[in-house]
Protein backbone atom coordinates (compact mmCIF):
# COMPACT_ATOMS: atom_id res chain seq x y z
CA UNK A 1 0.00 0.00 0.00
CA UNK A 2 1.33 3.45 -0.91
CA UNK A 3 1.81 5.59 2.21
CA UNK A 4 -0.49 8.61 2.26
CA UNK A 5 0.90 11.83 0.85
CA UNK A 6 0.34 15.23 2.37
CA UNK A 7 -2.16 17.37 0.48
CA UNK A 8 -0.44 20.67 -0.35
CA UNK A 9 -0.11 23.10 2.54
CA UNK A 10 -1.69 26.51 2.08
CA UNK A 11 1.24 28.89 1.68
CA UNK A 12 2.28 31.86 -0.40
CA UNK A 13 5.19 34.21 -0.92
CA UNK A 14 4.39 37.61 -2.39
CA UNK A 15 6.81 40.35 -3.32
CA UNK A 16 6.35 44.10 -3.29
CA UNK A 17 8.61 46.74 -4.79
CA UNK A 18 6.34 49.75 -4.35
CA UNK A 19 3.97 51.12 -1.73
CA UNK A 20 1.57 54.05 -2.09
CA UNK A 21 1.18 56.63 0.65
CA UNK A 22 -2.19 56.46 2.44
CA UNK A 23 -2.81 53.18 0.60
CA UNK A 24 -0.95 49.91 0.55
CA UNK A 25 1.79 47.96 -1.15
CA UNK A 26 1.42 46.48 -4.61
CA UNK A 27 1.90 42.75 -4.14
CA UNK A 28 2.70 40.15 -6.78
CA UNK A 29 3.17 36.41 -6.50
CA UNK A 30 6.30 35.36 -8.42
CA UNK A 31 5.24 31.71 -8.62
CA UNK A 32 2.24 30.17 -10.36
CA UNK A 33 2.42 27.18 -8.03
CA UNK A 34 1.28 28.99 -4.90
CA UNK A 35 -1.56 27.32 -3.00
CA UNK A 36 -3.00 30.68 -1.95
CA UNK A 37 -4.19 33.51 -4.19
CA UNK A 38 -3.80 37.28 -4.49
CA UNK A 39 -6.91 39.33 -5.31
CA UNK A 40 -7.29 43.13 -5.27
CA UNK A 41 -3.87 43.50 -3.66
CA UNK A 42 -4.83 41.21 -0.78
CA UNK A 43 -3.97 37.62 0.09
CA UNK A 44 -7.15 35.56 0.32
CA UNK A 45 -7.52 33.25 3.32
CA UNK A 46 -9.47 30.07 2.59
CA UNK A 47 -8.49 27.94 5.59
CA UNK A 48 -9.04 28.58 9.28
CA UNK A 49 -6.06 28.21 11.56
CA UNK A 50 -2.77 29.64 12.73
CA UNK A 51 -0.49 31.15 10.11
CA UNK A 52 3.23 31.78 10.28
CA UNK A 53 3.82 35.22 8.81
CA UNK A 54 7.17 36.61 7.67
CA UNK A 55 7.54 40.22 6.54
CA UNK A 56 10.72 41.77 5.14
CA UNK A 57 11.69 44.90 3.26
CA UNK A 58 13.83 48.03 3.01
CA UNK A 59 11.96 51.25 2.25
CA UNK A 60 13.11 54.33 0.35
CA UNK A 61 11.86 56.60 3.12
CA UNK A 62 10.61 56.48 6.68
CA UNK A 63 7.06 55.18 6.92
CA UNK A 64 4.47 53.61 9.16
CA UNK A 65 3.27 50.23 7.96
CA UNK A 66 0.47 47.97 9.14
CA UNK A 67 -0.62 44.56 7.93
CA UNK A 68 -4.37 43.97 8.33
CA UNK A 69 -6.56 40.91 7.96
CA UNK A 70 -10.10 42.05 8.77
CA UNK A 71 -11.99 45.33 8.92
CA UNK A 72 -12.48 46.53 12.48
CA UNK A 73 -9.71 44.32 13.84
CA UNK A 74 -6.24 45.39 14.95
CA UNK A 75 -3.30 44.81 12.63
CA UNK A 76 -1.19 41.65 12.42
CA UNK A 77 1.90 43.87 12.37
CA UNK A 78 2.23 47.55 13.06
CA UNK A 79 5.51 49.39 12.60
CA UNK A 80 5.87 53.09 13.22
CA UNK A 81 8.45 55.35 11.56
CA UNK A 82 10.69 52.61 10.17
CA UNK A 83 12.91 52.33 7.11
CA UNK A 84 13.07 48.55 7.18
CA UNK A 85 11.19 45.53 8.51
CA UNK A 86 12.25 41.95 9.28
CA UNK A 87 9.54 40.44 11.45
CA UNK A 88 8.00 37.06 12.11
CA UNK A 89 4.62 36.51 13.72
CA UNK A 90 1.90 33.95 14.32
CA UNK A 91 -1.79 34.79 13.96
CA UNK A 92 -5.11 33.00 13.79
CA UNK A 93 -6.84 33.74 10.48
CA UNK A 94 -10.10 32.40 9.07
CA UNK A 95 -12.00 31.86 5.84
CA UNK A 96 -12.98 35.22 4.28
CA UNK A 97 -10.05 37.11 5.87
CA UNK A 98 -7.89 39.13 3.51
CA UNK A 99 -4.32 40.13 4.33
CA UNK A 100 -3.35 43.59 3.05
CA UNK A 101 -1.05 46.53 3.76
CA UNK A 102 -1.71 50.06 4.90
CA UNK A 103 1.11 52.58 4.61
CA UNK A 104 1.56 56.21 5.63
CA UNK A 105 4.64 58.36 5.20
CA UNK A 106 5.55 61.41 7.17
CA UNK A 107 6.65 63.52 4.24
CA UNK A 108 4.41 66.12 2.63
CA UNK A 109 5.13 64.74 -0.85
CA UNK A 110 2.87 61.97 -2.08
CA UNK A 111 5.56 60.04 -3.89
CA UNK A 112 5.48 56.28 -4.13
CA UNK A 113 7.73 54.46 -1.68
CA UNK A 114 10.25 52.16 -3.33
CA UNK A 115 10.87 48.84 -1.61
CA UNK A 116 13.95 46.65 -1.82
CA UNK A 117 13.59 42.97 -0.88
CA UNK A 118 9.93 43.40 -0.04
CA UNK A 119 8.57 39.96 0.82
CA UNK A 120 5.53 38.66 2.67
CA UNK A 121 5.19 34.94 3.39
CA UNK A 122 2.14 33.19 4.86
CA UNK A 123 2.22 29.52 5.82
CA UNK A 124 -0.81 27.70 7.23
CA UNK A 125 0.02 25.76 10.40
CA UNK A 126 -3.22 23.78 10.85
CA UNK A 127 -3.81 21.56 7.84
CA UNK A 128 -6.79 19.35 8.44
CA UNK A 129 -8.88 22.26 9.69
CA UNK A 130 -11.80 23.96 7.95
CA UNK A 131 -11.24 25.29 4.42
CA UNK A 132 -13.64 26.77 1.87
CA UNK A 133 -12.81 27.63 -1.74
CA UNK B 1 -10.70 7.59 -3.83
CA UNK B 2 -10.96 10.46 -1.34
CA UNK B 3 -7.53 12.07 -0.76
CA UNK B 4 -6.28 11.58 2.80
CA UNK B 5 -7.05 14.38 5.24
CA UNK B 6 -4.61 15.69 7.80
CA UNK B 7 -5.36 14.62 11.35
CA UNK B 8 -5.63 17.77 13.49
CA UNK B 9 -2.32 19.40 14.39
CA UNK B 10 -1.57 19.83 18.08
CA UNK B 11 -1.90 23.55 18.73
CA UNK B 12 -3.32 25.94 21.29
CA UNK B 13 -3.77 29.62 21.96
CA UNK B 14 -4.10 30.67 25.59
CA UNK B 15 -4.75 34.12 26.95
CA UNK B 16 -3.63 35.66 30.21
CA UNK B 17 -4.82 38.92 31.76
CA UNK B 18 -3.17 38.56 35.17
CA UNK B 19 0.14 37.35 36.58
CA UNK B 20 1.03 36.82 40.23
CA UNK B 21 4.39 37.93 41.60
CA UNK B 22 6.71 35.02 42.51
CA UNK B 23 4.22 32.72 40.77
CA UNK B 24 2.94 32.60 37.23
CA UNK B 25 0.28 33.86 34.88
CA UNK B 26 -3.32 32.67 34.97
CA UNK B 27 -3.93 31.15 31.55
CA UNK B 28 -7.26 30.39 29.90
CA UNK B 29 -8.06 28.87 26.54
CA UNK B 30 -10.77 30.92 24.79
CA UNK B 31 -11.70 28.09 22.42
CA UNK B 32 -13.17 24.69 23.20
CA UNK B 33 -11.78 23.33 19.92
CA UNK B 34 -8.14 23.43 20.93
CA UNK B 35 -6.20 20.18 20.31
CA UNK B 36 -4.06 20.77 23.42
CA UNK B 37 -5.20 21.17 27.00
CA UNK B 38 -4.56 23.45 29.98
CA UNK B 39 -4.20 21.85 33.40
CA UNK B 40 -3.09 23.50 36.67
CA UNK B 41 -2.13 26.65 34.81
CA UNK B 42 0.17 24.73 32.47
CA UNK B 43 -0.13 23.63 28.86
CA UNK B 44 0.20 19.86 28.65
CA UNK B 45 2.50 18.43 25.97
CA UNK B 46 1.37 15.09 24.57
CA UNK B 47 3.44 14.90 21.40
CA UNK B 48 7.22 14.90 20.97
CA UNK B 49 8.69 17.32 18.48
CA UNK B 50 9.51 20.90 17.65
CA UNK B 51 6.99 23.55 18.62
CA UNK B 52 6.58 27.04 17.28
CA UNK B 53 5.97 29.30 20.27
CA UNK B 54 4.61 32.84 20.17
CA UNK B 55 4.41 35.00 23.30
CA UNK B 56 2.86 38.47 23.49
CA UNK B 57 1.71 40.86 26.17
CA UNK B 58 1.87 44.30 27.76
CA UNK B 59 2.37 44.36 31.53
CA UNK B 60 1.15 46.87 34.10
CA UNK B 61 4.61 47.09 35.65
CA UNK B 62 8.21 46.08 34.99
CA UNK B 63 8.81 42.38 35.58
CA UNK B 64 11.02 39.44 34.80
CA UNK B 65 9.22 36.63 33.03
CA UNK B 66 10.30 33.11 32.16
CA UNK B 67 8.46 30.36 30.32
CA UNK B 68 9.42 26.89 31.53
CA UNK B 69 8.70 23.40 30.23
CA UNK B 70 10.45 21.02 32.61
CA UNK B 71 11.82 21.11 36.15
CA UNK B 72 15.60 21.44 36.21
CA UNK B 73 15.79 22.70 32.65
CA UNK B 74 16.43 26.25 31.50
CA UNK B 75 13.50 28.35 30.31
CA UNK B 76 12.10 28.51 26.78
CA UNK B 77 11.99 32.30 27.06
CA UNK B 78 13.54 34.54 29.66
CA UNK B 79 12.92 38.28 29.72
CA UNK B 80 14.46 40.50 32.37
CA UNK B 81 13.00 43.82 33.51
CA UNK B 82 10.49 44.27 30.67
CA UNK B 83 7.07 45.91 30.38
CA UNK B 84 6.10 44.05 27.19
CA UNK B 85 6.94 40.94 25.21
CA UNK B 86 6.52 40.00 21.56
CA UNK B 87 8.71 36.98 20.92
CA UNK B 88 8.75 33.92 18.70
CA UNK B 89 10.79 30.81 19.33
CA UNK B 90 11.24 27.19 18.38
CA UNK B 91 11.84 24.47 20.96
CA UNK B 92 11.86 20.69 21.19
CA UNK B 93 9.26 19.49 23.70
CA UNK B 94 8.23 15.99 24.66
CA UNK B 95 5.39 13.99 26.19
CA UNK B 96 4.99 14.85 29.90
CA UNK B 97 6.41 18.36 29.51
CA UNK B 98 4.28 21.19 30.87
CA UNK B 99 4.63 24.78 29.67
CA UNK B 100 4.12 27.34 32.44
CA UNK B 101 5.12 30.87 33.46
CA UNK B 102 7.25 32.19 36.29
CA UNK B 103 7.10 35.89 37.07
CA UNK B 104 8.92 38.18 39.47
CA UNK B 105 8.48 41.92 39.86
CA UNK B 106 10.92 44.40 41.30
CA UNK B 107 8.43 46.28 43.42
CA UNK B 108 8.09 45.65 47.13
CA UNK B 109 4.30 45.39 46.86
CA UNK B 110 2.91 41.96 46.04
CA UNK B 111 0.11 43.19 43.81
CA UNK B 112 -1.05 41.19 40.82
CA UNK B 113 0.33 42.28 37.47
CA UNK B 114 -2.33 43.18 34.92
CA UNK B 115 -1.69 42.06 31.34
CA UNK B 116 -3.07 43.53 28.15
CA UNK B 117 -3.07 41.35 25.04
CA UNK B 118 -1.45 38.46 26.86
CA UNK B 119 -1.29 35.54 24.44
CA UNK B 120 0.73 32.35 24.24
CA UNK B 121 0.50 30.13 21.15
CA UNK B 122 2.05 26.68 20.72
CA UNK B 123 1.98 24.85 17.38
CA UNK B 124 3.43 21.37 16.92
CA UNK B 125 5.76 21.15 13.93
CA UNK B 126 6.31 17.38 13.74
CA UNK B 127 3.00 15.62 13.21
CA UNK B 128 3.58 11.92 12.68
CA UNK B 129 5.91 11.71 15.67
CA UNK B 130 5.28 10.07 19.03
CA UNK B 131 2.18 11.13 20.97
CA UNK B 132 0.64 9.79 24.16
CA UNK B 133 -2.69 10.87 25.63
CA UNK C 1 -10.23 2.00 8.45
CA UNK C 2 -7.13 3.39 10.18
CA UNK C 3 -6.86 7.18 9.75
CA UNK C 4 -3.83 8.18 7.71
CA UNK C 5 -0.68 9.05 9.64
CA UNK C 6 1.61 11.89 8.77
CA UNK C 7 4.83 10.82 7.13
CA UNK C 8 7.75 12.30 9.11
CA UNK C 9 8.37 16.01 8.53
CA UNK C 10 11.84 16.99 7.32
CA UNK C 11 13.46 18.67 10.31
CA UNK C 12 16.78 18.79 12.10
CA UNK C 13 18.45 20.35 15.11
CA UNK C 14 22.22 20.75 14.99
CA UNK C 15 24.48 22.03 17.73
CA UNK C 16 27.76 23.90 17.47
CA UNK C 17 30.23 24.65 20.24
CA UNK C 18 33.10 25.99 18.13
CA UNK C 19 33.55 28.17 15.07
CA UNK C 20 36.73 28.82 13.11
CA UNK C 21 37.65 32.30 11.92
CA UNK C 22 37.37 32.76 8.13
CA UNK C 23 35.63 29.38 8.01
CA UNK C 24 32.46 28.14 9.61
CA UNK C 25 31.01 26.44 12.66
CA UNK C 26 31.51 22.76 13.39
CA UNK C 27 27.98 21.33 13.48
CA UNK C 28 26.86 18.05 14.98
CA UNK C 29 23.44 16.46 15.16
CA UNK C 30 22.82 15.14 18.70
CA UNK C 31 20.03 12.80 17.59
CA UNK C 32 20.22 9.81 15.26
CA UNK C 33 16.50 10.15 14.54
CA UNK C 34 16.74 13.37 12.51
CA UNK C 35 14.96 13.31 9.14
CA UNK C 36 17.63 15.54 7.58
CA UNK C 37 21.35 14.91 7.33
CA UNK C 38 24.62 16.73 7.94
CA UNK C 39 27.40 16.31 5.39
CA UNK C 40 30.71 18.24 5.18
CA UNK C 41 29.55 20.64 7.88
CA UNK C 42 26.40 21.52 5.92
CA UNK C 43 22.74 20.57 6.30
CA UNK C 44 21.52 18.88 3.13
CA UNK C 45 18.18 20.02 1.70
CA UNK C 46 16.21 17.26 -0.04
CA UNK C 47 12.75 18.82 -0.18
CA UNK C 48 11.60 22.02 -1.86
CA UNK C 49 9.57 24.45 0.19
CA UNK C 50 9.52 26.98 2.97
CA UNK C 51 11.64 26.25 6.02
CA UNK C 52 11.32 27.68 9.50
CA UNK C 53 14.86 28.45 10.67
CA UNK C 54 15.91 29.12 14.26
CA UNK C 55 19.47 30.18 15.11
CA UNK C 56 20.80 30.69 18.64
CA UNK C 57 24.15 31.05 20.34
CA UNK C 58 26.49 33.05 22.55
CA UNK C 59 29.97 33.66 21.16
CA UNK C 60 33.28 34.06 22.97
CA UNK C 61 34.15 37.14 20.97
CA UNK C 62 32.59 39.66 18.64
CA UNK C 63 32.11 38.21 15.17
CA UNK C 64 30.22 38.51 11.94
CA UNK C 65 28.20 35.43 11.07
CA UNK C 66 26.29 34.47 7.94
CA UNK C 67 24.18 31.43 7.17
CA UNK C 68 24.25 30.48 3.49
CA UNK C 69 22.26 28.01 1.41
CA UNK C 70 23.56 28.34 -2.15
CA UNK C 71 26.70 29.64 -3.83
CA UNK C 72 26.11 33.04 -5.43
CA UNK C 73 23.00 33.73 -3.35
CA UNK C 74 22.66 36.10 -0.44
CA UNK C 75 22.68 34.68 3.09
CA UNK C 76 19.64 33.43 5.02
CA UNK C 77 20.92 35.33 8.04
CA UNK C 78 23.68 37.90 8.28
CA UNK C 79 24.78 39.35 11.61
CA UNK C 80 27.55 41.90 11.90
CA UNK C 81 29.71 42.41 14.99
CA UNK C 82 27.56 40.43 17.42
CA UNK C 83 28.32 38.44 20.56
CA UNK C 84 25.07 36.50 20.50
CA UNK C 85 22.27 35.50 18.16
CA UNK C 86 18.64 34.53 18.75
CA UNK C 87 16.88 34.79 15.41
CA UNK C 88 13.99 33.15 13.60
CA UNK C 89 13.41 33.29 9.87
CA UNK C 90 11.50 31.74 7.02
CA UNK C 91 13.13 30.93 3.69
CA UNK C 92 12.37 28.99 0.54
CA UNK C 93 14.95 26.25 0.01
CA UNK C 94 15.17 23.57 -2.65
CA UNK C 95 16.68 20.17 -3.40
CA UNK C 96 20.49 20.40 -3.68
CA UNK C 97 20.74 23.43 -1.37
CA UNK C 98 23.17 23.14 1.54
CA UNK C 99 22.90 25.26 4.67
CA UNK C 100 26.26 26.25 6.15
CA UNK C 101 27.97 28.96 8.22
CA UNK C 102 30.59 31.54 7.42
CA UNK C 103 32.27 33.36 10.28
CA UNK C 104 34.79 36.19 10.54
CA UNK C 105 36.15 37.84 13.66
CA UNK C 106 37.56 41.31 13.91
CA UNK C 107 40.52 40.44 16.09
CA UNK C 108 44.00 39.99 14.67
CA UNK C 109 44.44 36.73 16.57
CA UNK C 110 43.16 33.54 14.96
CA UNK C 111 41.51 32.08 18.04
CA UNK C 112 38.79 29.48 17.82
CA UNK C 113 35.45 30.97 18.78
CA UNK C 114 33.77 29.13 21.63
CA UNK C 115 29.99 28.94 21.44
CA UNK C 116 27.50 28.34 24.22
CA UNK C 117 23.99 27.15 23.40
CA UNK C 118 24.83 27.10 19.69
CA UNK C 119 21.78 25.64 17.96
CA UNK C 120 20.41 25.70 14.43
CA UNK C 121 16.96 24.25 13.73
CA UNK C 122 15.38 23.74 10.29
CA UNK C 123 11.76 22.60 9.91
CA UNK C 124 10.15 22.03 6.53
CA UNK C 125 6.82 23.80 6.21
CA UNK C 126 5.55 22.28 2.92
CA UNK C 127 5.28 18.51 3.26
CA UNK C 128 3.70 17.06 0.16
CA UNK C 129 5.98 19.05 -2.11
CA UNK C 130 8.87 17.78 -4.23
CA UNK C 131 11.61 15.77 -2.50
CA UNK C 132 14.60 13.87 -3.89
CA UNK C 133 16.91 11.61 -1.89
Amino acid sequence: QVPPQYPPIQSIRVQFTRCENEKGCIITSPSKDETMKVQDNSIIINCDGFYLISLKGYFSEELSLSLYYRKGRGPLFSLSKVTSVDSIGVAYLAFKDKVYFNVTTHSTSYKDIQVNGGELILIHQNPGGFCAY
Amino acid sequence: QVPPQYPPIQSIRVQFTRCENEKGCIITSPSKDETMKVQDNSIIINCDGFYLISLKGYFSEELSLSLYYRKGRGPLFSLSKVTSVDSIGVAYLAFKDKVYFNVTTHSTSYKDIQVNGGELILIHQNPGGFCAY
Amino acid sequence: QVPPQYPPIQSIRVQFTRCENEKGCIITSPSKDETMKVQDNSIIINCDGFYLISLKGYFSEELSLSLYYRKGRGPLFSLSKVTSVDSIGVAYLAFKDKVYFNVTTHSTSYKDIQVNGGELILIHQNPGGFCAY
Epitope: - | S66 | F59, Q114
Partner: antibody, heavy 120, light 107 residues
Framework: EVQLVESGGDLVKPGGSLRLSCVAS????????MSWVRQAPGKGLQWVAY????????TYTDAVKGRFTISRDNAKNTLFLQMNSLRADDTAVYYC?????????????WGQGTLVTVSS | SYELTQPPSVNVTLGETAHITCGGD??????VQWIQQNPGQAPVVIIY???NRPTGIPERFSGANSGNTATLTISGALAEDEADYYC??????????FGEGTQLTVL
Protein backbone atom coordinates in the same frame (compact mmCIF):
# COMPACT_ATOMS: atom_id res chain seq x y z
CA GLU D 1 32.90 47.30 43.60
CA VAL D 2 32.02 43.84 42.30
CA GLN D 3 30.87 41.47 45.02
CA LEU D 4 29.73 37.84 44.89
CA VAL D 5 28.56 36.36 48.18
CA GLU D 6 27.85 32.64 48.38
CA SER D 7 25.73 30.94 51.03
CA GLY D 8 23.98 27.64 51.68
CA GLY D 9 26.99 25.42 52.32
CA ASP D 10 26.54 22.88 55.11
CA LEU D 11 27.26 19.40 56.38
CA VAL D 12 24.95 16.92 54.65
CA LYS D 13 24.63 13.14 54.52
CA PRO D 14 25.32 11.19 51.30
CA GLY D 15 22.18 11.17 49.13
CA GLY D 16 21.05 14.46 50.62
CA SER D 17 20.36 17.79 48.94
CA LEU D 18 21.56 21.38 49.30
CA ARG D 19 20.77 24.64 47.52
CA LEU D 20 23.59 27.15 47.21
CA SER D 21 22.94 30.83 46.52
CA CYS D 22 25.18 33.60 45.28
CA VAL D 23 24.08 37.22 45.53
CA ALA D 24 25.79 39.62 43.13
CA SER D 25 26.29 43.36 43.47
CA UNK D 26 28.40 46.09 41.90
CA UNK D 27 27.71 45.07 38.29
CA UNK D 28 24.78 44.47 35.95
CA UNK D 29 24.15 40.83 36.84
CA UNK D 30 21.74 40.09 33.99
CA UNK D 31 24.39 40.88 31.35
CA UNK D 32 26.93 38.35 32.63
CA UNK D 33 27.20 34.60 32.12
CA MET D 34 27.90 32.81 35.42
CA SER D 35 29.67 29.67 36.67
CA TRP D 36 30.04 27.52 39.74
CA VAL D 37 33.57 26.21 40.37
CA ARG D 38 34.56 23.93 43.24
CA GLN D 39 37.76 23.02 45.07
CA ALA D 40 38.04 19.82 47.07
CA PRO D 41 40.26 20.02 50.18
CA GLY D 42 43.92 20.19 49.12
CA LYS D 43 43.01 19.88 45.43
CA GLY D 44 42.80 22.13 42.39
CA LEU D 45 39.92 24.08 40.86
CA GLN D 46 37.18 22.17 39.04
CA TRP D 47 34.49 23.79 36.91
CA VAL D 48 31.00 22.53 37.84
CA ALA D 49 28.27 24.35 35.91
CA TYR D 50 27.63 27.29 33.62
CA UNK D 51 24.59 29.40 32.78
CA UNK D 52 24.12 32.07 30.14
CA UNK D 53 23.01 35.57 31.07
CA UNK D 54 19.36 34.90 30.23
CA UNK D 55 19.33 31.50 31.96
CA UNK D 56 18.28 29.68 28.81
CA UNK D 57 21.44 27.66 28.17
CA UNK D 58 23.20 25.60 30.84
CA THR D 59 26.26 23.31 30.77
CA TYR D 60 27.57 20.86 33.39
CA THR D 61 30.68 18.86 34.07
CA ASP D 62 30.04 15.13 33.55
CA ALA D 63 30.43 14.29 37.25
CA VAL D 64 27.35 16.32 38.26
CA LYS D 65 25.06 15.94 35.22
CA GLY D 66 21.57 14.90 36.25
CA ARG D 67 22.25 15.67 39.92
CA PHE D 68 22.99 19.40 39.97
CA THR D 69 20.94 22.23 38.47
CA ILE D 70 22.25 25.73 37.92
CA SER D 71 19.69 28.54 37.68
CA ARG D 72 19.44 32.27 38.19
CA ASP D 73 16.98 34.97 39.16
CA ASN D 74 18.02 38.13 37.34
CA ALA D 75 15.36 40.13 39.18
CA LYS D 76 17.10 39.34 42.45
CA ASN D 77 20.70 39.32 41.16
CA THR D 78 21.05 35.77 42.45
CA LEU D 79 22.67 32.60 41.12
CA PHE D 80 21.67 29.17 42.44
CA LEU D 81 23.06 25.64 42.48
CA GLN D 82 20.58 22.92 43.44
CA MET D 83 22.59 19.86 44.49
CA ASN D 84 20.78 16.52 44.76
CA SER D 85 22.00 12.95 45.41
CA LEU D 86 25.15 14.32 47.02
CA ARG D 87 28.20 12.08 47.29
CA ALA D 88 31.34 12.20 49.43
CA ASP D 89 33.39 13.33 46.44
CA ASP D 90 31.20 16.45 46.14
CA THR D 91 32.83 17.75 49.33
CA ALA D 92 34.47 21.05 48.40
CA VAL D 93 34.43 24.79 48.67
CA TYR D 94 31.99 26.03 46.02
CA TYR D 95 32.76 29.35 44.36
CA CYS D 96 30.39 31.37 42.23
CA UNK D 97 32.07 33.33 39.43
CA UNK D 98 31.02 35.71 36.71
CA UNK D 99 32.47 35.42 33.24
CA UNK D 100 34.72 37.98 31.77
CA UNK D 101 32.62 39.80 29.19
CA UNK D 102 33.09 38.13 25.80
CA UNK D 103 35.22 35.25 27.04
CA UNK D 104 32.79 32.41 27.55
CA UNK D 105 33.82 29.90 30.17
CA UNK D 106 36.33 32.31 31.72
CA UNK D 107 35.42 32.85 35.39
CA UNK D 108 36.66 36.38 36.14
CA UNK D 109 35.14 37.77 39.33
CA TRP D 110 35.04 35.21 42.14
CA GLY D 111 33.18 34.97 45.42
CA GLN D 112 34.76 33.89 48.71
CA GLY D 113 33.20 30.43 48.53
CA THR D 114 30.92 28.30 50.69
CA LEU D 115 31.93 24.93 52.13
CA VAL D 116 29.88 21.82 51.34
CA THR D 117 30.74 18.71 53.37
CA VAL D 118 29.14 15.39 52.45
CA SER D 119 29.70 12.83 55.17
CA SER D 120 27.78 10.26 57.15
CA SER E 1 38.21 16.32 26.79
CA TYR E 2 40.77 19.11 26.72
CA GLU E 3 43.69 18.85 29.14
CA LEU E 4 46.12 21.43 30.49
CA THR E 5 49.53 20.45 31.86
CA GLN E 6 51.33 22.54 34.48
CA PRO E 7 54.47 21.78 36.54
CA PRO E 8 53.46 20.95 40.13
CA SER E 9 55.98 23.41 41.55
CA VAL E 10 58.32 26.20 40.51
CA ASN E 11 61.00 27.83 42.66
CA VAL E 12 62.26 31.37 42.15
CA THR E 13 64.80 33.49 43.99
CA LEU E 14 63.49 36.72 45.45
CA GLY E 15 63.76 39.46 42.82
CA GLU E 16 64.39 37.02 39.97
CA THR E 17 62.06 36.07 37.12
CA ALA E 18 59.72 33.08 37.34
CA HIS E 19 58.17 31.31 34.35
CA ILE E 20 55.16 29.03 34.81
CA THR E 21 54.13 27.06 31.76
CA CYS E 22 50.79 25.62 30.71
CA GLY E 23 50.70 23.04 27.92
CA GLY E 24 47.70 22.13 25.82
CA ASP E 25 46.99 20.94 22.31
CA UNK E 26 47.01 24.06 20.07
CA UNK E 27 46.45 26.18 23.18
CA UNK E 28 47.48 29.19 21.09
CA UNK E 29 44.05 28.98 19.44
CA UNK E 30 42.37 29.51 22.81
CA UNK E 31 42.32 32.43 25.22
CA VAL E 32 44.17 31.65 28.45
CA GLN E 33 43.52 33.05 31.91
CA TRP E 34 45.92 32.83 34.84
CA ILE E 35 44.49 32.62 38.34
CA GLN E 36 46.36 33.21 41.59
CA GLN E 37 45.19 31.61 44.83
CA ASN E 38 46.70 32.22 48.24
CA PRO E 39 46.10 29.59 50.95
CA GLY E 40 42.56 29.81 52.33
CA GLN E 41 41.69 32.65 49.94
CA ALA E 42 39.40 32.96 46.92
CA PRO E 43 40.97 32.75 43.46
CA VAL E 44 41.94 36.01 41.71
CA VAL E 45 42.41 36.47 37.97
CA ILE E 46 45.79 38.04 37.26
CA ILE E 47 45.92 37.60 33.47
CA TYR E 48 43.02 37.32 31.03
CA UNK E 49 42.86 36.85 27.26
CA UNK E 50 46.47 35.59 27.17
CA UNK E 51 48.26 38.78 28.19
CA ASN E 52 45.86 41.35 29.68
CA ARG E 53 46.12 42.45 33.30
CA PRO E 54 42.98 43.37 35.26
CA THR E 55 42.99 46.70 37.09
CA GLY E 56 45.09 46.51 40.25
CA ILE E 57 47.33 43.64 39.13
CA PRO E 58 51.03 44.66 39.24
CA GLU E 59 52.99 45.07 36.00
CA ARG E 60 55.43 42.33 37.02
CA PHE E 61 52.81 39.78 35.95
CA SER E 62 52.68 39.14 32.20
CA GLY E 63 51.38 36.40 29.92
CA ALA E 64 52.06 34.95 26.50
CA ASN E 65 50.41 32.20 24.49
CA SER E 66 51.31 30.52 21.22
CA GLY E 67 51.55 27.06 19.71
CA ASN E 68 51.09 24.44 22.40
CA THR E 69 52.29 26.48 25.39
CA ALA E 70 51.07 29.45 27.41
CA THR E 71 53.44 31.11 29.86
CA LEU E 72 52.95 33.24 32.95
CA THR E 73 56.00 35.39 33.72
CA ILE E 74 56.63 37.08 37.07
CA SER E 75 59.47 39.58 36.71
CA GLY E 76 61.15 40.47 39.99
CA ALA E 77 59.24 38.01 42.17
CA LEU E 78 58.23 39.17 45.63
CA ALA E 79 57.56 37.10 48.74
CA GLU E 80 53.85 37.97 48.45
CA ASP E 81 53.74 36.22 45.06
CA GLU E 82 54.14 32.85 46.79
CA ALA E 83 50.85 31.14 45.93
CA ASP E 84 49.19 28.54 43.72
CA TYR E 85 48.78 29.51 40.05
CA TYR E 86 46.24 27.94 37.69
CA CYS E 87 45.94 28.33 33.95
CA UNK E 88 42.44 28.11 32.51
CA UNK E 89 40.78 28.00 29.09
CA UNK E 90 37.22 27.72 27.78
CA UNK E 91 36.58 24.59 25.74
CA UNK E 92 33.70 23.14 23.73
CA UNK E 93 31.33 25.95 24.36
CA UNK E 94 31.74 26.98 27.95
CA UNK E 95 33.38 24.16 29.77
CA UNK E 96 36.02 25.93 31.85
CA UNK E 97 39.13 23.75 31.93
CA PHE E 98 41.74 24.35 34.65
CA GLY E 99 45.32 23.17 34.89
CA GLU E 100 46.32 21.12 37.94
CA GLY E 101 47.97 24.17 39.46
CA THR E 102 51.58 25.18 40.14
CA GLN E 103 52.88 26.04 43.59
CA LEU E 104 55.29 28.96 43.36
CA THR E 105 57.90 29.18 46.09
CA VAL E 106 59.92 32.36 46.48
CA LEU E 107 63.33 31.53 47.98
Amino acid sequence: EVQLVESGGDLVKPGGSLRLSCVASGFTFRTYHMSWVRQAPGKGLQWVAYITRDGISTTYTDAVKGRFTISRDNAKNTLFLQMNSLRADDTAVYYCASDLVLVLGAPFYWGQGTLVTVSS
Amino acid sequence: SYELTQPPSVNVTLGETAHITCGGDSIGRKYVQWIQQNPGQAPVVIIYKDSNRPTGIPERFSGANSGNTATLTISGALAEDEADYYCQVGDSGTKAVFGEGTQLTVL
